[in-house]
Interface confidence: low
């Protein structure tokens, strides 16, 4: 029958070549001579000449060793023709399958594999995967089936079998408990890849397992007891630096310390922060300490890490005894800022108020008073009693020194300590008004027409407060009322001047008396320019028109 089963040829054959593989035979050779030929890749197309056929006998010949890793299978066609070249058979499929020899070692894809795992993990935790390849056949043979193993481990601590490797996947896992970064930060494993599923050729690579830090070490105080001396009253004063040691990775959250005051600071006088470089606890005063109230504080400070503990660990506590040092404290005015009312215009020497200070120190000290700021020089203080009296005329309407009716004075109290200290008090004098100013009209010049004149309106102002100001009253005096009329508005803060009779163009002086609601009168001269014009006039009298 004109068929041929697949021909299996091992790769790397030693010959001798040409090597006879199989004989093609057509049963149509009775009475006629048959010539055989082959076509296809490996015969008449690249790679040419690997196979030939003896034309007359039909023997298929192999001319060289085959390499399965290059070509696994050759598909050729066998042809049979008669002497006259006529085809006597259909082309026959010839499959030549190259069978594998274990001629390739495994190759790791890297020289060094790197992985990491957290210290203290449970056995069974996966760490990393290594991979090796083998070009041989892993489907039909074991030649290309790679088996992984761990050849050695360095260091061999706490023992020499800390890791295992999955034979077929190359996954490295933790097999023993006891990974401790603080003892062994890195393991170097020599891993092997062996073909024939572990029975053949071997190649090696290195697997580096970095042990990652877990927060399995608590910070410890070194020392645990501290004693410090702090002057009273100082805010932000560094009291003490507390030092800790931690075996975890420096500058990591598992190493960085977090401090808490857990006792002894009922008055909330202290705060503790972590120094960013030294990791020390910096204890400082949040409020000033008071020697007279409490001369010693015993604080209890606890330290943890930024990161939570990975396992249950005891929390370290330190004791800090803070001794408060007495300082000569400045006298304190009571209240520090005193608001009092005083009437403007009071007599010189008249008592304004008494403003005294108290000394916080335990020993009695003499306090003397001075005025440090009195811009208008209106006041004096008795150095012993703190009595403040008028030394000048207090003027509420003096805008240079008085703002919003308030005159501000600074008083000093100095104790007799060595060296002496001085405290400051602020006296805010609210000046009450007296009727010491009369009403003033604005402007004091008017210009008006002598025919159908428009009344000229003046604003009235008074520096005093109500009831010593508006509503105002107006009156023309010294015969000014013969030709002129003054009318105060309904609101009482403006006055309108108008002509009662015709006056020729000229300048006239009017005597206007204005009085406030407290009946204080003020006489003001108003200069009135009368123009030959009708109705309203602005700036100057119009020039007379001259006909030409």
């Amino acid at each position: 029958e004109w068929v041929m089963p697949p021909i299996f040829v091992p790769e790397n054959g030693k010959g001798p070549f040409p090597q006879r593989l199989n004989q093609l035979k057509s049963n149509k050779d009775r009475g006629t001579k048959i010539f055989y030929s082959i076509t296809g890749p490996g015969a008449d197309s690249p790679p040419e000449g690997v196979f030939t056929i003896e034309k007359e006998s039909g023997w298929l010949l192999l001319h060289m060793p085959l390499d399965r890793e290059k070509i696994v299978k050759y598909e050729l066609y066998g042809h049979a023709v008669s002497e006259n070249g006529a085809s006597v058979e259909e082309p026959m499929n010839i499959s030549i399958i190259v069978t594998d020899q274990n001629d390739n070692k495994p190759k790791f894809t890297q020289d060094t594999f790197r992985g990491s795992v957290l210290e203290g993990v449970m056995p069974g935790t996966s760490v990393m995967q290594v991979t090796a390849t083998d070009e041989d056949d892993a489907v039909n043979t074991y030649n290309g089936v790679v088996a992984y193993s761990i050849h050695s481990q360095e260091p061999k601590e706490p023992h020499d079998l800390m890791f295992t490797i999955h034979k077929s996947t190359g996954t490295i896992s933790v097999i023993s408990s006891g990974l401790d970064r603080e003892k062994v930060p890195e393991y170097r494993l020599t891993v092997q890849a062996t073909d024939m599923d572990g029975e053949g050729s071997t190649t090696t690579a290195e697997a580096v397992v970095q042990i990652l830090d877990a927060n399995d070490n608590a910070p410890e105080f070194e020392p645990q007891k501290y004693e410090a001396w702090v002057p009273e009253n100082e805010v932000g004063h560094e009291v003490q630096r507390l030092t800790v040691t931690d075996l975890d990775v420096p500058n990591s959250p598992a190493w960085r310390a977090t401090y808490h005051i857990v006792g002894g600071d009922d008055g909330d006088h202290f705060t503790i922060t972590t120094h960013p470089e030294t990791n020390q606890g910096v204890l400082t005063t949040k409020k000033g300490l008071d020697f007279e109230a409490q001369d010693q504080h015993t604080l209890y400070v606890e330290v943890t890490n930024e990161a939570p503990f990975a396992v249950k660990l005891p929390t370290a506590t330190a004791t800090v005894v803070v001794h408060v040092k007495d300082v000569n404290e400045a006298p304190v005015f009571v209240p520090p800022s005193k608001v009092i009312e005083a009437q403007e215009g009071i007599s010189i020497g008249e008592l304004v108020c008494i403003y005294t200070a108290q000394d916080p120190d335990k020993e009695d000290q003499k306090i003397s008073y001075t005025i440090s700021r009195d811009p208008a020089n209106w006041l004096a203080v008795d150095p012993d009693s703190g009595q403040i009296t008028a030394a000048g005329i207090l003027d509420r309407e003096d805008e240079q020194f008085v703002k919003n009716n308030v005159y501000e004075v600074m008083v000093l109290a100095t104790d007799s300590g060595n060296p002496p200290t001085t405290g400051t008090g602020t006296l805010l004098l609210t000046l009450t008004d007296i009727n010491d100013h009369g009403p003033i009209p604005e402007p004091r010049q008017i210009i008006i027409c002598n025919q159908s004149p428009v009344p000229q309106v003046l604003n009235i102002t008074d520096k005093d407060l109500s009831p010593n100001s508006s509503p105002f009253q107006a009156q023309l005096t010294h015969d000014s009322d013969i030709y002129w009329m003054a009318e105060v508005s309904e609101k009482g803060d403006t006055v309108a001047l108008s002509l009662k009779k015709f006056l020729k163009q000229d300048t006239y002086d009017l005597h206007l008396s204005l009085s406030d609601h407290g009946n204080r009168e003020q006489l003001t001269m108003i200069r009135a320019t009368v123009c030959d014009c009708h109705g309203q006039v602005f700036n100057d009298c119009p020039r007379p028109w001259k006909g030409g």
Epitope: Q110, T131, S168
Partner: antibody, heavy 120, light 112 residues
Framework: EVQLVQSGGGLVKPGGSLRLSCAAS????????MSWVRQAPGKGLEWVAT????????YYPDSVKGRFTISRDNAKNSLYLQMNSLRAEDTAVYYC?????????????WGQGTTVTVSS | DIVMTQSPSSLPVTPGEPASISCRSS???????????LEWYLQKPGQSPQLLLY???NQFSGVPDRISGSGSGTDFTLKISRVEAEDVGVYYC?????????FGQGTKVEIK
Amino acid sequence: EVQLVQSGGGLVKPGGSLRLSCAASGFTFSTYGMSWVRQAPGKGLEWVATISDGGSYTYYPDSVKGRFTISRDNAKNSLYLQMNSLRAEDTAVYYCARHYYGSDWYFDVWGQGTTVTVSS
Amino acid sequence: DIVMTQSPSSLPVTPGEPASISCRSSQSIVQSNGNTYLEWYLQKPGQSPQLLLYKVSNQFSGVPDRISGSGSGTDFTLKISRVEAEDVGVYYCFQGSHVPLTFGQGTKVEIK
């Protein structure tokens, strides 16, 4: 910033030689496998060579085996491709590429490419 | 050698619509360690290729969620749930399981 900067491309006659370079920065070069991939004009991507992180292992397709050599200098953070016996069909844009971390043979960072023209 | 065959070779798409690219390997690309090293790359016009997906379905960092991968053995698919203008370029599948490493011939995605 992780970067691969290529140099060394140019015009060469058939049978000639050329050396491509790839300078790495922004990562620990010695811990990554590296490869060269090429792209002929108007065609797709073709893998050319691979070298393991320490340089012990090299891999090539049959099309370049025996003619091209991949190498690396970890001290200089540099990858090289020495191309000998060049043919017209080697004309392409050549890319160097970094293997994804670990043992995986695929490429997460690529160079900008350098053109090699083989013509008489 | 393992041959990677992509279809279609050209894919005109409408923005906002889904798109799908198929990749078939001539033999299984499951490695002996159980991993399937099938990756997808995109080469935008005038640029170097960039990694999109690795080990069949894992998104590389910075790749939008609308791009996903699936498949096993010899048949693999890349899907874009809603195409955007920035998705145009040539998509290549790639096998890294067996040497020689091989790419698909590419699928050109362009806006209609």
